[in-house]
């Protein structure tokens, strides 16, 4: 059901992410190295364990999940945060949660293209990424 | 646990360079930035600029940018300020302190250093 | 610039008493940005409560922060010895990072 997301993925193109991050509360230093990074996305398959890499010079972050199942994630800007992933009409949709807030990433394919949309409150910010 | 440790003083003549250091342990040191304060005696603090140790980038004060330059050593994991044309308005101490992320404070500090420039 | 203005510059407070520290910011910043840190003479900063309300590792539970876009305080409910010391606020949402002048806390 994820297998379409399978695969090694290269960020090619990204709009609105600095003001994504201010809208999250990153810091100035954290957003300046954050958006310089260029990162590669690696999503593999494992029964129903679904597992998302991302590997850049800013930082190397990897979540392991079950479909619908709260875990604890510390999110490459360092945040600690509870995430939900679910599938929604072929999208993987994650939900962030930490001090009374949260964000939604929203990762869905789109021809060869693996579009990450992410939204904070009415900030969006469209990163996109094609096959490494 | 992370530890920042800084030479205690520096004496240096009027018009010389001198390169601070800071090695770190107790953490991986490509994962937090560092970062470096100036504060005179009696006086506050003031941020000279911060370095990422993973990539070499480097974000100055612009008050500092041709005063100090930043560097590090991933090897030895350890942080350079190098302060040239040094005069009198520079005798201070000097802190390295490294970021945590997302929030962007400095959670843990080096003991810093006492620099005296004087002839 | 951020301008981060505190008041009071010098203060005095007997042991018990309830203590507020005031950062004046001179335009918004998000509240995950703005930090405290405590300094006694002769050592180094210490952080002290980050993204506004969080007490760093250690920190007595009499300390508080508080504040939101431009207004920010930290508060201690009851005064005591140890407390007396510098405390600078901070903010890296916008560059460049900026303290404040500090505000000296001493014990009356």
């Known amino acids: 059901m994820c297998d379409a997301f399978v695969g090694t993925w290269k960020l090619v193109s990204s709009e609105n992410f600095d003001d994504y991050m201010k809208e999250v509360g990153v810091g100035f230093a954290t957003r300046k190295v954050a958006g310089m990074a260029k990162p590669n996305m690696i999503i593999s398959v494992n029964g129903d364990l679904v597992t998302i890499r991302s590997e850049s010079t800013f930082k190397n972050t990897e979540i392991s999940f079950k479909l619908g199942v709260e875990f604890d994630e510390i999110t490459a800007d360092d945040r600690k945060v509870k995430s939900i992933i679910t599938l929604d009409g072929g999208a993987l949709v994650q939900v962030q949660k930490w001090d009374g807030k949260s964000t939604t990433i929203k990762r869905k394919r789109d021809g060869d293209k693996l579009v990450v949309e992410c939204v904070m409150k009415g900030v969006t910010s469209t990163r996109v990424y094609e096959r490494a | 646990q992370v530890q920042l440790q800084q030479p205690g003083a520096e004496l240096v003549k009027p018009g010389a360079s001198v390169k601070l250091s800071c090695k770190a342990s107790?953490?991986?040191?490509?994962?937090?930035?560092i970062t470096w304060v100036k504060q005179r005696p009696g006086q506050g603090l003031e941020w000279i600029g911060d370095i990422s140790p993973g990539s070499g980038s480097t974000t100055n004060n612009e008050k500092f940018k041709s005063k100090a330059t930043l560097t590090v050593d991933t090897s030895s994991s350890t942080a350079y300020m190098q302060l040239s044309s040094l005069t009198s308005e520079d005798s201070a101490v000097y802190y390295c302190?490294?970021?945590?992320?997302?929030?962007?404070?400095?959670?843990?500090w080096g003991q810093g250093t006492t620099l005296t420039v004087s002839s | 610039e951020v301008v981060l203005t505190q008041s009071p510059a010098l203060m005095a407070a007997s042991p018990g008493e309830k203590v507020t520290i005031t950062c004046s910011v001179s335009?918004?910043?998000?509240?995950?940005?703005l930090h405290w840190y405590q300094q006694k003479s002769e050592t180094s900063p210490k952080p002290w409560i980050y993204g506004t309300s969080n007490l760093a590792s250690g920190v007595p539970v009499r300390f508080s922060g508080s504040g939101s876009g431009t207004s920010y305080s930290l508060t201690i409910s009851s005064m005591e010895a140890e407390d007396a010391a510098t405390y600078y606020c901070q903010q890296w949402s916008h560059y460049p990072l900026t303290f404040g002048a500090g505000t000296k806390l001493e014990l009356k």
């Open positions: 107790g953490y991986t040191f490509t994962s937090n930035a």
């Open positions: 335009s918004s910043i998000s509240s995950s940005n």
């Open positions: 302190a490294r970021l945590r992320g997302f929030y962007d404070y400095f959670d843990f």
